[in-house]
Interface confidence: low
Amino acid sequence: FVRTKIDTTENLLNTEVHSSPAQRWSMQVPPEVSAEAGDAAVLPCTFTHPHRHYDGPLTAIWRAGEPYAGPQVFRCAAARGSELCQTALSLHGRFRLLGNPRRNDLSLRVERLALADDRRYFCRVEFAGDVHDRYESRHGVRLHVTAAPRIVNISVLPSPAHAFRALCTAEGEPPPALAWSGPALGNSLAAVRSPREGHGHLVTAELPALTHDGRYTCTAANSLGRSEASVYLFRFHGASGAST
């Protein structure tokens, strides 16, 4: 386990510890990296270690969620003397080592980002052979994934006393603001539920009582864009028809 101190230099490698004669285990990562969903992101991680000129077997690992216990998303192994770190695990094939672990660089590229990738990542290096040692970043790097709004569900549901209600669920980061418009509504924020536990990027807005037939439109907007979807309410013979 590790501690973290402030380093005010811009360059990850331009720190006093790299020029000191007695190196210690340390890792340098930025607190946060931001990227848009669909794009790629680079998670920088460099390290120092006390085993001068180590060229034995090594393993590079990245975890998600929490250090030590979080699930591995990437793992590669380099044989003695080899600069090639052979990938043994790349979750969904989207993780690729950019750095060279032999040169103290474990930087990772994540392809095709999704909102679900928005979490903290921890780099780890393990030495095996003459030297048995390992080190893992403690606080890790937060990958902040941003995304324009996307409406994931819109529906009309029956409610008591032959009434109907409409639900609109959208995702995005920052979490989008939702608004309903429709017959006799104008623009209404309706009953917006805050992001659900475990679904931090999902927001739901409810129209509790649809009083008129016609088209009801849900608009989701954040700083990156907006999205719309509609449902239609036709009350004939006590039934409803809905399409988007």
Partner: antibody, heavy 128, light 107 residues
């Protein structure tokens, strides 16, 4: 000057609850991890819990897991230890302590350090 | 969890003596080890961090060595104010366990 002051100790019956506070001053509180360590009468030090500088992670000793909760309010420069279902073996002096080094907003520079600033301790006695 | 053991549990020494205390971890902890000094009725004081680094303000007669699972705290010339109890602590992975302590008293 840099200091930590614990409060909230006292005598409590087994099974009851108590909340300890640790008030910090003289440093940028939100940049430091904070620990609780306890010492039973005549015994050694026992590490109890840690909360990261931003409150994002917490770890506990097995002996208190599920019963104690560490939390912090960075706006009040205070860390709390909520102790539920207290047992006789929880009787101890409780110290809060600060990690040696702080966390910056630019680069996390990982090391392994110790606890360099300690409070004076607050006594918790669990007895019927 | 990682268990820490210390030896001896107590020792008697005289002012000017060279004193060594050993600490052993139940598994390799690299250099993630700290040493503390505690006097009766007082809070502990950090002496050594990262196995061998002297904490600011601590006299140079204190030194730490070791890596992996075996560590040593050495006081090169014991002074009257050094009579206290010494604890090692691992910070390799939580819970960050302490050793049981070594009490150093006057012979």
């Amino acid at each position: 000057q840099v200091q930590l002051v614990e409060s909230g100790g006292g005598v409590v019956q087994p099974g009851r609850s108590l909340r300890l506070s640790c008030a910090a001053s003289g440093f940028i509180f939100s940049s430091y991890d904070i620990y609780w360590v306890r010492q039973a009468p005549g015994k050694g030090l026992e590490w109890v819990a840690v909360i990261w500088h931003d409150g994002s992670n917490k770890y506990y000793a097995d002996s208190v897991k599920g019963r104690f909760t560490i939390s912090r309010d960075n706006s009040k420069n205070t860390v709390y230890l909520q102790m539920n279902s207290l047992r006789a073996e929880d009787t101890a002096v409780y110290y809060c302590a600060r990690d040696t080094h702080s966390y910056g907003s630019r680069i996390y520079y990982d090391y392994n350090y110790g606890m360099d600033v300690w409070g004076q301790g607050t006594t918790v006695t669990v007895s019927s | 969890d990682i268990q820490m053991t210390q030896s001896p549990s107590s020792l008697s020494a005289s002012v000017g003596d060279r004193v060594s205390i050993t600490c052993r971890a139940s598994q390799s902890i690299s250099s993630y080890l700290n040493w503390y000094q505690q006097k009766p009725g007082k809070a502990p004081k950090l002496l050594i961090y990262a196995a061998s680094s002297l904490q600011s303000g601590v006299p140079s007669r204190f030194s730490g060595s070791g890596s992996g699972a075996d560590f040593t705290l050495t006081i090169s010339s014991l002074q009257p104010e050094d009579f206290a109890t010494y604890y090692c602590q691992q910070t390799y992975s939580p819970p960050f366990t302490f050793g049981p302590g070594t009490k150093v008293d006057i012979k």
